[in-house]
């Protein structure tokens, strides 16, 4: 709390501008009117206030509005935003893409902080879902954003939203979240033709089904090692050599390098050592010629 | 470029004046706060003065306040500091710097002009 | 407020991890940076509001810390990191910087 004092003579502030730059915390509080101050935010992002002085303007501001700023301060609220408490803004109506635009403009270059989280899921929820542009604005700022939704949060995210997904904004995606994802992308892109639907659809592939696989197999999409390490371990396992092979086309010879890493290894030990020979890459722990393969869930379902 | 030159330095008996310049390039100089950063010989850092983007308003440390004022020129694009009453421990490098538009760290210092005082 | 900057000097190597911790008498948010001196030369900003990478600046530069103390992390020195690092708080007037902390080659 800053104790009230009486504004000196001549203090008083007529408008918010650089006269107050070196204003003592006590001659802000005194001279500077709350009222004057909302009305005039945007220019305190002109001037440069020490972060004490920072927390009394944010303080007359809080005395003004107890309830929450209104949007018309939100949207200018500038450097000021960086001193707002996640509590502060959880009173918030936050609309405008304008003014979430304006508040991330002010923390770029900062980890997302517990404010901004705050900030981003009061104006998701205010919108009842992830739209396009909401979305677009998310992922320029914070290309981590999408990975950061629980599979939950993710499935109220429109299949026209996927569009403005770009391959780096699913870097951290785990399985759960690309079993989300791609359904929608796969939706998303349907009517684009084969070699441009591979092209989208490739960073959402970790969380493709077996069968759309073995479809990606016979479209001659030469799938690179980067992309097929990420797939589904239980998407892979079925998928026979013939088909691995059509799947990544020059790049099946990456095999050798990945053997001992899942998917690969896990493959491997499905997949008969006959076959694997075909490949001519030395691929080692098939199943042996003349070994039977039996499939016990297959037995367990039909039991 | 974005640039800042400072001029003026040198040596002056303790008791007498200098006037200090420092030319800035390649940023629109009014919109901008400026100070003045000197460092004693083989010492740290010490924020001497500051004025505001206008020139209106200003601020001195306690060691140099009624001896030094700081001032603009927005058409020449200069900031200045008239140094009077010089003593032995004001020798030191003054650096020119540039602070963000909403903040006081600086992006952008001048290579500094060596004020010695001594008799 | 005074900032106390600790160690005054230490020596390293190249590829060493150096850390570089920054006290302030009394609590200034975040509102703390970091800058590089070189001999003969002007200060160079590494980190601004205690945490955010100054832009150009190698990522092997990293800042932390709130309140009262902070920390400049180099991961990796690297030979043209031999130089005399400050701190400096933007909290409240008047500005004032620590003492600095010399890194010399071991």
């Known amino acids: 709390e800053v104790e009230k004092t009486a504004c000196p003579s001549g203090k008083k502030a007529r408008e918010i501008d650089e006269s107050l730059i070196f204003y003592k915390k006590w001659e802000l509080e005194a001279c500077v009117d709350a009222a004057l101050l909302a009305t005039q935010m945007d220019r305190v992002n002109a001037i440069p206030f020490t972060y004490e002085q920072l927390d009394v303007l944010k303080h007359k501001l809080d005395e003004l509005y107890p309830q929450g700023y209104p949007e018309s301060v939100i949207q200018h609220l500038g450097y000021l935003f960086l001193k707002m408490s996640p509590e502060d803004i959880r009173k918030w109506n936050v609309t405008s893409l304008e003014t979430l635009k304006a508040l991330l403009e002010v923390n770029k270059g900062h980890e997302m902080s517990p404010q901004v989280a705050t900030l981003i899921d009061r104006f998701v929820k205010g919108r009842g879902q992830l739209d396009k542009d909401t979305l677009d604005t998310l992922t320029a700022f914070y290309p981590g954003y999408l990975c950061s939704l629980s599979p939950e949060e993710l499935s109220s995210v429109p299949p026209s939203s996927i569009w403005a997904v770009r391959p780096q904004d699913l870097d951290t995606c785990d399985p759960r979240q690309l079993d989300v994802l791609y359904p929608k992308a796969r939706l998303a892109f349907q009517n684009m033709n084969g070699s441009e639907y591979f092209v989208k659809i490739q960073s959402f592939l970790g969380g493709a089904p077996t069968e759309d696989l073995k479809a990606l197999s016979q479209q001659n999409v030469s799938m690179d090692l980067a992309t097929f390490m990420k797939l589904r371990t239980d998407a892979v396992l079925p998928l026979t050599v013939a088909e691995v092979q059509k799947l990544l086309g020059p790049h099946v010879e990456g095999l050798k390098a990945e053997e001992r890493h899942r998917p690969v290894r896990d493959w491997i030990l499905r997949q008969r050592q006959d076959d694997l020979d075909t490949l001519g890459l030395g691929l080692q722990g098939g199943i042996p010629n003349g070994y039977l393969v039996l499939d016990l869930s297959m037995q367990e379902a039909l039991s | 470029e974005v640039q800042l030159l400072e001029s003026g330095g040198g040596l002056v008996q303790p008791g007498g004046s200098l006037r200090l310049s420092c030319a800035a390039s390649?940023?629109?100089?009014?919109?901008?706060?400026m100070s003045w950063v000197r460092q004693a010989p083989g010492k740290g850092l010490e924020w001497v003065s500051a004025?505001?983007?206008?020139?209106?308003?200003?601020y001195y440390a306690d060691s140099v306040k009624g001896r030094f004022t700081i001032s603009r020129d927005n058409s020449k694009n200069t900031l200045y500091l008239q140094m009077n009453s010089l003593r032995a421990e004001d020798t030191a490098v003054y650096y020119c710097?540039?602070?963000?538009?909403?903040?006081?760290?600086?992006?952008?210092w001048g290579r500094g002009t060596l004020v010695t005082v001594s008799s | 407020i005074q900032l106390t900057q600790s160690p005054s000097s230490l020596s390293a190597s190249v590829g060493d991890r150096v850390t570089i911790t920054c006290r302030a008498s009394?609590?200034?948010?975040?509102?703390l940076a970091w800058y590089q001196q070189k001999p003969g030369k002007a200060p160079k900003l590494l980190i601004y509001?205690?945490?955010s990478l100054e832009s150009g600046v190698p990522s092997r530069f990293s800042g932390s810390g709130s309140g009262t103390d902070f920390t400049l992390t180099i991961s990796s020195l690297q030979p043209e990191d031999f130089a005399t690092y400050y701190c400096?708080?933007?909290?409240?007037?008047?500005?004032?910087f620590g003492g600095g902390t010399k890194v010399e080659i071991k």
């Open positions: 509001d205690a945490s």
């Open positions: 710097a540039k602070g963000r538009r909403f903040s006081w760290y600086f992006d952008l």
């Open positions: 004025i505001s983007g206008s020139g209106g308003s200003t």
């Open positions: 400096q708080q933007f909290n409240n007037y008047p500005l004032t």
């Open positions: 390649g940023f629109t100089f009014s919109s901008y706060a």
């Open positions: 009394q609590g200034i948010s975040s509102a």
